[in-house]
Amino acid sequence: YDFTNCDFQKIEADYLRTISKDLITYMSGTKSTDFNNTVSCSNRPHCLTEIQSLTFNPTPRCASLAKEMFARKTKATLALWCPGYSETQINATQAMKKRRKRKVTTNKCLEQVSQLLGLWRRFIRTLLKKQHHHHHH
């Protein structure tokens, strides 16, 4: 999917309002600095591509993120603000439903969510630079 035509401001608002809280809930006190950042992105569409990949594509050591609350909200946000996105996800959703949900939060999943937090930061910081705004913690 090409994320070029998404409404980036609306996606940013959704992230700050809800998705970020769910990611931090998932991390449960684990600090982002506990992990090295190995995934990066260079512009807004690229960031969303990487975010989608890390959120929804299972990896051998972390197969369960797609059913987490932050993933569901990420999917809803992308479907809402990226034209045609939901149509591209029908097959992926059907495949996801066939997988067993794993309840255990592994260290590798925490690391993956830490990477996601970094990607979201890059997405929003890139957005802020375009708007010439200064970020306040």
Partner: antibody, heavy 123, light 112 residues
Amino acid sequence: QVQLQESGPGLVKPSGTLSLTCAVSGDSISNYNWWSWVRQPPGKGLEWIGEIYHSGRTNYNPSLKSRVTLSVDTSKNQFSLRLSSVTAADTAVYYCARDAPSDYGDYGFFDHWGQGTLVIVSS
Amino acid sequence: DIVMTQSPLSLPVTPGEPASISCRSSQSLLHSNGYNYLDWYLQKPGQSPQLLICLGSDRASGVPDRFSGSGSGTDFTLKISRVEAEDVGVYYCMQALQTPYTFGQGTKLEIK
């Protein structure tokens, strides 16, 4: 708004145990914050003692680790510090502070502090 | 532990003039995510510390824009563009990269 309030004895005898509690209002201690203790000897700088998460996970300053115990009481929305085998060098103003996560999972930002309580170690 | 060193330790400033405080860490505070885990706090006389700057350069909520933070790696600077009487107190840098969090010795800013 978020407020933190330290309480406990202002005078502790040498070799005794210093016990302080930090009552939190305006925020649930079960939110995704770490809760820290920082101390400041009279006329000196700040020293981080340790931190606790609502689950009971802790991180301690290695220089004090053998003497420090942190605990949390979610039902009372408070957390506590115990420092054993105290000496005059432990005389300080003790602060509790909230370390709230940024929108990206960062910690290490003490955005709310208690007013501090002076603890004197003396016989 | 990461050692934090501030200079100067005392800083007399005339109101309206700029002020600058340096902070150096014994190891880099730059994380692989591209951000520096360095905070600045101000402790006004008789008060608790208050957060001014986090991540090296991000002003905390409600902090006047005359305060700015800069630097990367091991060398950081807090600048006040025009000092006001209410800015007096002790300024501390703190590394937030890893526990134990450690503070600089403090820089006492006073009005000339």
